[in-house]
């Protein structure tokens, strides 16, 4: 993702509560940083349908975060 000026998060608003698993191409997690003070879960959709932000408080987001953290650490 390109860098934005300090204090600007990539996601706007609270995000969707869930995305159909079959529609997910990739999930990216952006951890709090100088650019944004909150965790952001960004879903890339299949068939070039763009990206959506997942509400980080949602059940699906928590599952994705756990899965990614297990894989990375």
């Amino acid at each position: 993702f390109p860098m934005f000026k300090r204090g600007r998060c990539l996601c706007i608003g609270p995000g969707v509560k869930a995305v159909k698993v079959a529609d997910i191409e990739k999930a990216s997690i952006m951890y709090p940083s100088n650019n944004c003070d909150k965790i952001e879960v960004i879903i890339t959709l299949k068939e070039n349908k763009g990206q959506r932000c997942l509400n980080p408080k949602s059940k699906q987001a928590r599952l994705i975060i756990k899965k990614v953290e297990r894989k990375n650490f």
Epitope: P2, C11, P14, I43, G50, Q51
Partner: nanobody
């Protein structure tokens, strides 16, 4: 059923003001970002302003910055666009749209918005 209904358009002289309203039903504003777009004859739909009611963040296109102000009344489930110092080039049909899970990268991409109103005509005469 989700519905967005715009009102407040009309004919105004250059330099004048109008306030557009976007009444939402079937969902709460806190769950969505609400944007205003406009489309002039023969031109593409242009995103001009957006608000996220959950935290009150606002965004403006350069073409309206300093002249237009977006606000929301969560109790009325309504978003407003106060338009001041109107110019003839502001003449267009104005639409409000609702998006969930929007990214800053695709702020003004119409296809990223889930619901649209029917539009209200704004005409600015010189």
């Amino acid at each position: 059923e989700v519905q967005l209904v715009e009102s407040g358009g009309g004919l105004v002289q250059a330099g004048g003001s109008l306030r557009l309203s976007c009444a939402a039903s079937g969902f709460t504003l806190d769950d969505y970002a609400i944007g205003w777009f406009r489309q002039a004859p023969g031109k593409e739909r242009e995103g001009i302003s957006l608000i996220t009611s959950d935290d009150g963040s606002t965004y403006y296109a350069d073409s309206v910055k300093g002249r237009f102000t977006i606000s929301s009344d969560n109790a009325k489930n309504t978003v407003y666009l106060q338009m001041n110092s109107l110019k003839p080039e502001d003449t267009a049909v104005y639409y409000c749209a609702a998006a969930q899970g929007l990214l800053l990268l695709s702020l003004w991409v119409p296809t990223q918005y889930d619901y649209w109103g029917q539009g209200t005509q704004v005409t600015v005469s010189s």
